[in-house]
């Protein structure tokens, strides 16, 4: 045991030695030799029997975020939050777990993906599956009938995710919802406008927002001969049309879900259509569909929606798609989903979707499910699929080989000579107190070269250098890391000069 501990210590020391040599930019031969030694030490260490059984990893469908990934995430969140705030939203938060009863019966076939927690003193609890149901519970509990809010938090789904495509079991959702009784389609149009603003701002590529209405779907199923009990299950089949062919969907509906082939064919005639407002007009003339009250209401609202979307200047981004049948049970009206488009291989081909990056819709009955008297609070909202967006942004930055800053430090307080630690500490404290983002190296007498190197690696734009002479003269040498130009700045002017150079407001407002 003592021998293993000694060997582990040597592995640690050798690892430090290798890192040190690399930092010092030692000769390639020396580094190669010391790396070879490290590998030989590790080989002797072999597997630790006590640790062998336990593989150190994050649970399936989860991941850690490195500083680089966090920097990407912060930028994405910043774009989203600024947009939500621009549209006047307040922010709320809710517990990460809810009473199991709260989540039951809200998600249809997706309910099997809810994480249940072990017994917690008699309460049956589940991790939240989305942010919408907790929001509805919050409205009902607090008897709220009117709110525009956003909520950014992690949700949990016992999925079998393809993590390479930005799918996880624990992931962030960014939700924006408008609750309240308003004139038709105005809040819905604003939600679509927000979706388009965010996706455009993130510059992740061309996108298309598919729009449909639950009432149109339900009306269509009714006139095609689908029984009420099969509506939801047929919906989930139709929703797969963006991923698989109509033949496969039809086979599932007929073979697995017991639908008559002629009923499936009638559904196929409708759900394979997509277009703009002209398709809405066309369906309003459809002799069968226009006779269905629900479908007629849905089509009327969609016509109005397209008017507002034109006024918002986003009608070119919207496609009325009858195959959109989002799987969640709680939608009652307009539903929408944004997909990124891959550039077609040949001109004239249909644009190809590469997965949903945002979605939402109207859910007028959800709050009523929690109200003892069944009082309804109409709601409409959207959810941004940020995990997929993080993956896309990360891949794009890697492809461009862009260096991402993981800190916001504006200036490093450095010294050119020894025995100036006290002066550095005093100066860095002054800068912090003035709201400047500043750092110093945690060494008594760091070499100036090491300090400048640290700035280059961390992307710190400025170095405030203290020297014996500068102290006597009451100045600080301010050096630009990129241009390497140095100027003497009076100590009392330093804060202002740093703020001026880094474009920071001169007062902390």
């Amino acid at each position: 045991m003592a021998e293993r501990a000694a060997l582990e210590e040597l592995v640690k020391l050798q690892g430090e030695r290798v890192r040190g040599l690399k930092q010092q930019k030692a000769s390639a031969e020396l580094i190669e030799e010391e790396v070879a030694k490290l590998l030989k030490l590790k080989a002797q260490l072999g597997p630790d029997e006590s640790k062998q059984k336990f593989v150190l990893k994050t649970p399936k469908g989860t991941r850690d975020y490195s500083p680089r990934q966090m920097a990407v995430r912060e930028k994405v969140f910043d774009v989203i939050i600024r947009c939500f705030k621009r549209h006047g939203a307040e922010v709320i938060d809710t517990p990460v777990f809810e009473l199991k009863e709260t989540l039951m019966g809200k998600y249809g076939e997706d309910s099997k993906l809810i994480y249940d927690l072990k017994d917690q003193g008699g309460e049956l609890l589940s991790l939240r599956y989305d942010l919408t149901v907790p929001f509805a519970r919050y409205l009902a509990m607090n008897k709220l009938t009117n709110i525009k809010r956003y909520h950014i938090a992690k949700v949990y789904r016992r999925d079998n995710p393809a993590m390479t495509r930005g799918r996880y079991r624990e992931f962030y959702q960014c939700d924006f919802d408008i609750a309240g009784n308003f004139d038709p389609m105005i809040p819905d149009a604003e939600c679509l406008k927000i979706m388009c603003e965010i996706l455009s701002s993130l510059q992740i590529g061309d996108f298309l927002v598919k729009v449909n209405d639950r009432r149109i779907l339900d009306g269509m199923f009714a006139i095609c001969g689908v029984s009420d009990s099969k509506f939801r299950t047929i919906c989930s089949s139709v929703d797969k049309l963006d991923k698989v062919s109509w033949e496969e969907v039809k086979n599932e509906m007929v073979g697995e879900k017991g639908l008559a082939p002629e009923v499936a064919d009638r559904i196929g005639d409708y759900v394979q259509q997509h277009g703009g407002v002209s398709l809405v007009e066309q369906l309003l003339q459809d002799p069968k569909l226009s006779q269905n009250k629900q479908a007629l209401e849905g089509l009327g609202d969609l016509k109005l929606l397209f008017e507002y979307l034109t006024l918002f200047g986003i009608d070119d981004k919207i496609s009325f798609d009858l195959s959109l049948a989002r799987g969640l049970d709680y939608y009652t009206g307009v539903i929408y989903e944004a997909v990124l488009l891959q550039t077609p291989a040949q001109a004239g081909e249909e644009p190809l979707g590469v997965g949903s990056v945002a979605a939402g819709g109207r859910y007028d009955g959800l709050v009523g499910m929690f109200d003892p008297k069944g009082r309804k609070v109409p709601c409409v909202g959207l959810s941004i699929g940020v995990e997929r967006i993080f993956s896309i942004v990360e891949q794009r930055l890697e492809a461009l080989e862009e260096k991402i800053r993981t800190t916001e430090t504006q200036v490093l307080v450095a010294s050119a000579q020894k025995k100036l630690l006290e002066e550095r500490l005093k100066l860095v404290s002054e800068l912090w107190d003035a709201g400047i983002k500043a750092e110093l190296l945690y060494k008594k007498n760091p070499k100036l070269l090491n300090q400048l190197q640290y700035c280059e690696e961390a992307g710190i734009p400025l170095v405030a250098i203290i020297g014996e002479q500068e102290l006597k003269d009451g100045v600080i040498k301010l050096r630009s890391v990129t241009s390497r130009e140095e100027v003497d700045v009076r100590r009392e002017d330093l804060v202002e000069e740093i703020k001026r150079r880094t474009g920071q407001p001169l007062c902390i407002c």
Epitope: L7, L10, L13, Q14, L41, Q44
Partner: antibody, heavy 120, light 107 residues
């Protein structure tokens, strides 16, 4: 048993040459870095040279660089030190030693030493 | 080169005494330090490596501590067979250097 045995020491005139050998037994010789360390009479220890198990890496103290050559024959479990242009100050007991944990520059097994005397 | 300085050069002590020998490096060597014992006409014997790890077969009365530039070898209760010369050695960078030695004599 695990041991190192040096041989080849003796009296040699300044400018002369000598070849020291070190026979290893009881361990997998080719896995270990090996080293020559010397000790002048009544003095301290000085690291002379080392060689890695694969022959790939060697190094020499400045005092012997260009005059001494370290080598090994893994098939024969033997380490060698070829000493040319010998000087008075090379007079010492020469120890061969193996590195602790194969690659760490600390001698955990030493030979008994062989005396080299350089004198006219 | 890294210089290693041992103190004292010699020390007199009796059986049962606690003895401490110090070794200083001219620059930081982390824990890359070994202690050896050498008896007249014999090869050095490794006692401690990595500053504080006891070599297999060495009695537990020997212990090492320190890191950076300051290291100590302690013999908690001297035994008759412990009277010898002790050397420290840095294994941080080549040329690997030894201290000048500390002779432990019977009082």
């Amino acid at each position: 048993q695990v041991q190192l045995v040096e041989s080849g020491g003796g009296l040699v005139k300044p400018g002369g040459s000598l070849r020291l050998s070190c026979a290893a037994s009881g361990f997998t010789f080719s896995d270990y870095y090996m080293t020559w360390i010397r000790q002048a009479p009544g003095k301290g220890l000085e690291w002379v040279s080392y060689i890695s198990g694969s022959f790939r890496y060697t190094n020499y103290a400045d005092s012997v660089k260009g005059r001494f050559t370290i080598s090994r024959d893994n098939a024969k479990n033997s380490l060698y030190l070829q000493m040319n242009s010998l000087r008075d100050e090379d007079t010492a007991v020469y120890f061969c030693a193996r590195y602790v944990y194969q690659v760490v520059a600390i001698g955990d097994l030493w030979g008994q030493g062989t005396l080299v005397t350089v004198s006219s | 080169d890294i210089q290693m300085t041992q103190s004292p050069s010699s020390v007199s002590a009796s059986v049962g005494d606690r003895v401490t020998i110090t070794c200083r490096a001219s620059q930081g060597i982390s824990s890359w330090l070994a202690w050896y014992q050498q008896k007249p006409g014999r090869a050095p014997k490794l006692l401690i490596f990595a500053a504080s790890s006891l070599q297999s077969g060495v009695p537990s009365r020997f212990s090492g501590s320190g890191s950076g530039t300051h290291f100590t070898l302690t013999i908690s209760s001297l035994q008759p067979e412990d009277f010898a010369t002790y050397y420290c050695q840095q294994a941080k960078s080549f040329p690997y250097t030894f201290g000048q030695g500390t002779k432990l004599e019977i009082k």
